[in-house]
């Protein structure tokens, strides 16, 4: 009778995480009597996966009934596969012996590779806001995928970016991998509505890549432009001065009126108008009673935007017997402004 051989017909098996792996093994003879054991890895550090005779292996089931007389199929199924299960599995025939069963013949091994999907990419931007023309960095991370091959792309508003660096870790063999990429993006004033997208393509995703997004509205700060104008006379002794705060983002803004350097009023932007590009406009006005002044008045509109140092714009108000119109306001955004008389 020919000596028993242990046959593992599959050199490799590829299984998706969460699925069941079938590891095939047959013997060519029933002799000698003794159990089959499955191990992951070889040598003294090998890990016991299944012992036909002793132990409890809840994730493992046998394909056929190993107790049947003529059974020579020692294939097993391992349920709920994770990347940690990857490795080479050996079907090993033991013959009964004392004090322990004696290893008799091993199969050639089956390499189990686990296909694991990458986690949803997480995109994070800089901790602090930046202004247009500045370059900011965005990072994208995805974890737990296998095999190692993966493709990552960056987009801004649908346009592919080229200035980025990507690393896949670890460099050597591992049960699963992580990807980390950093992209550089130059901000423009129009980026309030812009999105940065990190797209990850992997064999497990069947052509449907995963995307992570970051809204540049979380990153950009567009500083306002200020314009102070004197409006037509409302009454014989009153002048209306407006401060137009244009194209700012985010909305957090505080405006202070100064009269000859002295604070006359402070207000917070509330009812703003939104421009198509996502920036905001706001207008504040001040009613100045010129009869209360003998000298010229310097009016200053001082704006503190998003916690940044204040910017200001001044207007010299000439005090004369007949105040003249010093400018015209073509903007209609005067909602939410406050009237204030200076006495």
């Amino acid at each position: 009778e020919e000596e028993l051989q242990v046959i593992q017909p599959d050199k490799s098996v590829l299984v998706a995480a969460g699925e069941t792996a079938t590891l095939r093994c047959t013997a060519t003879s029933l002799i000698p009597v003794g159990p089959i054991q499955w191990f992951r890895g070889a040598g003294p550090g090998r890990e016991l996966i299944y012992n036909q005779k002793e132990g409890h292996f809840p994730r493992v089931t046998t394909v056929s009934d190993l107790t049947k007389r003529n059974n020579m199929d020692f294939s097993i199924r391992i349920g709920n596969i994770t990347p940690a299960d990857a490795g080479t599995y050996y079907c090993v025939k033991f013959r009964k012996g004392s004090p322990d069963d004696v290893e008799f013949k091993s199969g050639a091994g089956t390499e189990l590779s686990v296909r694991a999907k990458p986690s949803a990419p997480v995109v994070s931007g800089p901790a602090a806001r930046a202004t247009p023309q500045h370059t900011v960095s965005f990072t994208c991370e995805s974890h737990g995928f296998s095999p190692r091959d993966i493709t990552l792309k960056w987009f801004k508003n649908g346009n592919e970016l080229s200035d980025f660096q990507t690393n896949v870790d670890p460099v050597g063999e591992s049960v699963s991998y992580s990807i980390h990429s950093t992209a550089k993006v130059v901000l423009t004033r129009e980026d309030v509505h812009s999105q940065v997208i990190c797209e990850v393509a992997h064999v497990t995703l069947q052509g449907d890549p995963l995307r992570g997004t970051a809204n540049l509205s979380e990153t950009i700060r567009v500083p306002p432009t200020l314009e102070v104008t004197q409006q037509p006379v409302r009454a014989e002794n009153q002048v209306n001065v407006t401060c137009q705060v244009r194209k700012f983002y985010p909305q957090r803004l505080q405006l202070t009126w100064l009269e000859n350097g002295n604070v006359s009023r402070t207000e917070t932007a509330s009812t703003v108008t939104e421009n198509k590009d996502g920036t905001y406009n706001w207008m504040s006005w001040l009613l100045v009673n010129v009869s209360a002044h003998r000298d010229d008045v310097k009016l200053t509109c001082q704006v503190e935007h998003d916690g940044q140092p204040a910017v200001s714009k001044s207007h010299d108000l000439k005090v004369s017997a007949h105040p003249k119109e010093q400018g015209s306001n073509t903007a209609a955004e005067n909602t939410g402004s406050n009237e204030r008389n200076i006495y």
């Epitope: 002799i31 009597v33 002793e54 013959r95």
Partner: antibody, heavy 120, light 107 residues
Framework: EVQLQQSGPELVKPGASVKMSCKAS????????MHWVKQKPGQGLEWIGY????????KYNEKFKGKATLTSDKSSSTAYMELSSLTSEDSAVYYC?????????????WGQGTTLTVSS | DIVMTQSHKFMSTSVGDRVSITCKAS??????VAWYQQKSGQSPKLLIY???YRYTGDPDRFTGSGSGTDFTFTISSVQAEDLAVYYC?????????FGGGTKLEIK
């Protein structure tokens, strides 16, 4: 260490019944098959039958059908053999012995034996 | 039932000698034959199964051979402690059957 501990000697009258036990330790009781073997004084060995504790499946030597009944108790890892309608021909040493499978007839561990004497 | 015949009920040998015990099956049992040693007052002990596989690593002076219907158990160098009855048994099909035994006596 694998051990099969059998119950003590029995002296019974003809026509009576006897139930002997074999307590297994040192291995997973339900993963192996338990056989019973008879040896009359100064004679050879005779296989009586087996029980598979995993599924309580039994197989008997035709010669011992109706004479021997094999049972097992998983909770105590104990196999039992009951012999009925005893005669002097049943006087013998009875061994329990373990094998790997129900199709494996080579017995790697044996109990120390239970001596049965049938006498009036 | 398969009948296993051990032609020698007794065999006499000396310490250090090589001795062979034979067993014949009434039909082909392939290599499904086991050999047991039973010392006086003790339980049988498995030495060889599947005709040639030694159950315990030691002593390696015990060997088995044969297939089909003719089988041999050999002690390469008999020791005093080998005094015992040796049984062959077929484990090819039920009912498992034993030979009548060969008693090894030391001169």
């Amino acid at each position: 260490e694998v051990q099969l501990q059998q119950s003590g000697p029995e002296l019974v009258k003809p026509g009576a019944s006897v139930k002997m036990s074999c307590k297994a330790s040192g291995y997973t009781f339900t993963s192996y098959v338990m056989h019973w073997v008879k040896q009359k004084p100064g004679q050879g060995l005779e296989w009586i039958g087996y029980i598979n504790p995993y599924n309580d499946g039994t197989k008997y030597n035709e010669k011992f059908k109706g004479k021997a009944t094999l049972t097992s108790d998983k909770s105590s890892s104990t196999a039992y053999m009951e012999l009925s309608s005893l005669t002097s021909e049943d006087s013998a040493v009875y061994y329990c012995a373990r094998s790997y499978y129900d199709y494996d007839g080579s017995f790697d561990y044996w109990g120390q034996g239970t001596t049965l004497t049938v006498s009036s | 039932d398969i009948v296993m015949t051990q032609s020698h009920k007794f065999m006499s040998t000396s310490v250090g000698d090589r001795v062979s015990i034979t067993c014949k099956a009434s039909q082909d049992v392939t290599t499904a034959v086991a050999w047991y040693q039973q010392k006086s007052g003790q339980s049988p002990k498995l030495l060889i199964y599947s005709a040639s596989y030694r159950y315990t690593g030691d002593p390696d002076r015990f060997t088995g051979s044969g297939s089909g219907t003719d089988f041999t158990f050999t002690i390469s160098s008999v020791q005093a402690e080998d005094l015992a009855v040796y049984y062959c048994q077929q484990h090819y099909s039920t009912p498992w059957t034993f030979g009548g035994g060969t008693k090894l006596e030391i001169k």
